[in-house]
């Protein structure tokens, strides 16, 4: 099954949400509307 990383730090395994503690992908705009980095 595909493995996805989710907003506040989730991975989806077999459609189950499993939280992991380190804000995975938080530098990629995981939080809706939060400015990330500079203008690129």
């Amino acid at each position: 099954d595909a493995e996805f990383r989710h907003d506040s730090g989730y991975e989806v395994h077999h459609q189950k949400l499993v939280f992991f503690a380190e804000d995975v992908g938080s530098n990629k705009g995981a939080i809706i509307g939060l400015m990330v980095g500079g203008v690129v």
Partner: antibody, heavy 112, light 111 residues
Framework: QVQLVQSGAEVKEPGASVKVSCTGS????????VHWLRQLPEKGLEWIGR????????IYTPKFQDKATLTVDTSTDTAYMELSSLRSEDTAVYYC?????WGQGTLVTVSS | DIVMTQSPLSNPVTPGEPASISCRSS???????????LYWYLQKPGQSPQLLIY???HLASGVPDRFSSSGSGTDFTLKISRVEAEDVGVYYC????????FGQGTKVEIK
């Protein structure tokens, strides 16, 4: 001016599909997640899902899993959300969001 | 789904006076990593929403410091120390402990 520009309002018949676009202006949309939300008339916000433009990976709210399809064309810095099997309950303003930038919203009206 | 419930649904305010909005989640948003996955958004009339507060008590860039947020795992409060005319609109709380869900909104208007 840095902004996200969405396509214009759409009127569709029940059962049809619609594809809403979201283009970065002065902003590389392919760098950050693109979120899509909707706002029903006089109602609150619902998160539809998000796409990682780097690899196309998506996450959807379960109720939109079979309704919405999120894609990105990195060559044109444009994100798309396609809604299928439209019903009157899908009448809403749809927003894209990337980093701190919000699109202006696209009104989709479903009516026979 | 985690359900977010806001009160009041309408909040007439007086410019210069403080105001507060409450939000309750059906499940604790405090994770064992110490972060609380609670957010506040404001949608001004005729505009797209904007982020005010992230992870319960962090002010988003450009948001005036008259806004503050506090709470426990399930009960949260957004406070405006001195309301200004530009603060009118609909305020939403949201969570992303499990995907994203939003409260029904609180309309803040000038008395």
């Amino acid at each position: 001016q840095v902004q996200l520009v969405q396509s214009g309002a759409e009127v569709k018949e029940p059962g049809a599909s619609v594809k809403v676009s979201c283009t970065g202006s002065g902003f590389n949309i392919h760098v950050y997640y693109v979120h899509w939300l909707r706002q029903l008339p006089e109602k609150g916000l619902e998160w539809i899902g998000r796409i990682d433009p780097e690899n196309g990976e998506t996450i959807y709210t379960p109720k939109f899993q079979d309704k919405a399809t999120l894609t990105v064309d990195t060559s044109t810095d444009t994100a798309y959300m396609e809604l299928s099997s439209l019903r009157s309950e899908d009448t809403a303003v749809y927003y894209c969001v990337s980093s701190g930038y919000w699109g202006q919203g696209t009104l989709v009206t479903v009516s026979s | 789904d985690i359900v977010m419930t806001q009160s009041p649904l309408s909040n007439p305010v007086t410019p210069g006076e403080p105001a507060s909005i409450s939000c309750r989640s059906s499940k604790s948003l405090l994770h064992r990593n110490g972060k609380t996955y609670l957010y506040w958004y404001l949608q001004k009339p005729g505009q797209s929403p904007q982020l005010l507060i992230y992870q319960m008590d962090h002010l988003a860039s450009g948001v005036p410091d008259r806004f503050s947020s506090s709470g426990s795992g399930t009960d949260f409060t957004l406070k405006i120390s001195r309301v200004e005319a530009e603060d009118v609109g609909v305020y939403y709380c949201a969570q992303n402990l499990e995907l994203w869900t939003f409260g029904q909104g609180t309309k803040v208007e000038i008395k």
